[in-house]
């Protein structure tokens, strides 16, 4: 993978081990936990990242320590099953044979069941709403400046095509970023909105997944944007099937 050639590291994923044993003797970076080779020129899938986070040795030097307030979804962290492309398998089970269905971002979308539970397809999360509250500032941020800065961030840091950032809303101190990406819109090579949202979430928590980069330093016209709370809402192309309907955050 060309991004990793020079010194055999993975710029986009610090939860990897890289070695010059790939095709042609080139650098190859494998995700901790799964051992799957990852493309270091783009974001790694959320499934492989979660698997690395759960499976990696506690004393590993490249590990990012999970925040005690980590909020991935209402069920918290789990060790997922990923398919051969690194995506979440539609059905996830724990070691006590409790199973549930997930969406494309790995969030549970059904009640929990047993091994007989069927999840016919991986349902795509096509709309992600990232709800942020920033720390008090002298005055409100200029909405258009904030909009431009967040769009730049998703484009440059997470390599998400600008068309997938549907909107940025702002009512001080709440910022909402809407990401939309239908199955038909996502072309080969496009970053998935779920992966971009996960990298952003980890950045906001001060747990950057990028190798050797400083943490996220968000500024709007030079003024630091410090986030004190994050909530992420996931909307699927097919509504979830809970016995008591709820919105998964």
């Amino acid at each position: 993978h060309t991004a990793a050639q020079d010194n055999c590291t993975c710029p986009t994923n610090k939860m990897t081990v890289c070695s010059p044993d790939g095709p042609g003797g080139r650098c190859q970076c494998r995700a901790l936990g799964s051992g799957m080779a990852v493309d270091c020129s783009t974001l790694t899938s959320k499934c492989l990242l979660l698997k690395a986070r759960m499976s990696a040795p506690k004393n590993a030097r490249t590990l990012v320590r999970p925040s005690e307030h980590a909020l991935v979804d209402n069920d918290g962290l789990y060790d997922p099953d990923c398919d051969p492309e690194g995506r979440f398998k539609a059905r996830q089970c724990n070691q006590t044979s409790v199973c549930w269905c997930v969406n494309s971002v790995g969030v549970r979308r059904t009640d929990k069941g047993d091994l007989s539970l069927r999840c016919d397809e991986l349902v795509r999360t096509h709309h992600i709403l990232i709800d942020l509250r920033h720390r008090p500032t002298a005055g409100a941020f200029n909405h258009s400046d904030l909009d431009a800065e967040l769009r730049r961030l998703f484009r440059e840091r997470y390599r998400l095509h600008p068309k997938f950032v549907a909107a940025v809303h702002y009512e001080q101190p709440t910022i909402q970023i809407e990401l939309r990406q239908n199955t038909s819109q996502k072309a080969a090579g496009d970053v998935d909105i779920g992966d971009a949202a996960y990298y952003f979430e980890r950045d906001i928590k001060g747990e950057s997944l990028f190798q050797g980069r400083g943490g996220l330093d968000l500024r709007v016209r030079g003024e630091p944007l410090q986030v004190e709370r994050t909530l992420i809402y996931y909307l699927d192309e097919i509504p979830p099937k809970f016995s008591m309907k709820r919105l998964t955050a």
């Epitope: 055999c8 081990v17 070695s19 010059p20 044993d21 790939g22 095709p23 042609g24 003797g25 901790l32 799964s34 051992g35 799957m36 080779a37 990696a56 040795p57 004393n59 590993a60 030097r61 490249t62 051969p84």
Partner: antibody, heavy 114, light 107 residues
């Protein structure tokens, strides 16, 4: 040139442990995964697990978790595999191999016998 | 775990013949397959890596092909020194399993 030199044959008692070694030379030891492979007499190859000496990362085939323990000493450029609670099923030749797959040790024969 | 199925278990050919070994993976593994030859009481020797990459020092009569789930190793003109066991191994995701092997015999 790249070489992987394994320790000599071992005759051990059931229920005991054995630790075999694989000394690397001719390449940067901390840059490559090192794999361990088992071969019982007249049988095929079984992947036990691997270790990345540059970060002390290890992975195990579930069938060998609890049986094999992989370690490495970067100062002596040597990888080790300890096999515990030995039974006759553990009698085999054990190979170490560099992760680019082109260099293998000569194998260490472990015989478990009372 | 990814299962690798090798067939047939035994191949018997005459010197000079062309022979192919098959290896089938239980899921798509791209080109992450490697082929080894093991002679009696010897260490495995890498013949081909990443499905089709040739290895320095390995005779040009050995070649590999395939991607996804179906792979093959071909010896285009078998020599008597080629007798031994042939194994495929994947390196797609841990654990890196091996196929059960194919024994090559010379008539």
């Amino acid at each position: 040139q790249v070489q992987l030199q394994q320790s000599g044959a071992e005759l051990v008692r059931p229920g005991t442990s054995v630790k075999i070694s694989c000394k690397a030379s001719g390449y940067t030891f901390t840059n490559y995964w090192l794999d361990w492979i088992k071969q019982r007499p007249g049988q095929g190859l079984e992947w036990i697990g691997n270790i990345f000496p540059g970060g002390d990362y290890t992975n195990y085939n579930e069938e060998f978790r609890g049986k094999a323990t992989l370690t490495a000493d970067t100062s002596s450029r040597t990888a080790f595999m300890q096999l515990s609670s030995l039974t006759s099923e553990d009698s085999a030749v054990y190979f170490c191999a560099r992760s680019s797959y082109d260099y293998w040790g000569q194998g260490t024969l472990v015989t478990v016998s009372a | 775990d990814i299962l690798l199925t090798q067939s047939p278990a035994i191949l018997s050919v005459s010197p000079g013949e062309r022979v192919s070994f098959s290896c089938r993976a239980s899921q798509n593994i791209g080109t992450s397959i490697h082929w080894y030859q093991q002679r009696t009481n010897g260490s495995p020797r890498l013949l081909i890596k990443y499905s089709s990459e040739s290895i320095s020092g390995i005779p040009s009569r050995f070649s590999g092909s395939g991607s996804g789930t179906d792979f093959s190793l071909t010896i285009n003109s078998v020599e008597s020194e080629d007798i031994g066991d042939y194994y495929c191994q994947h390196s797609y995701t841990w654990p890196f399993t091996f196929g059960s092997g194919t024994k090559l015999e010379i008539k």
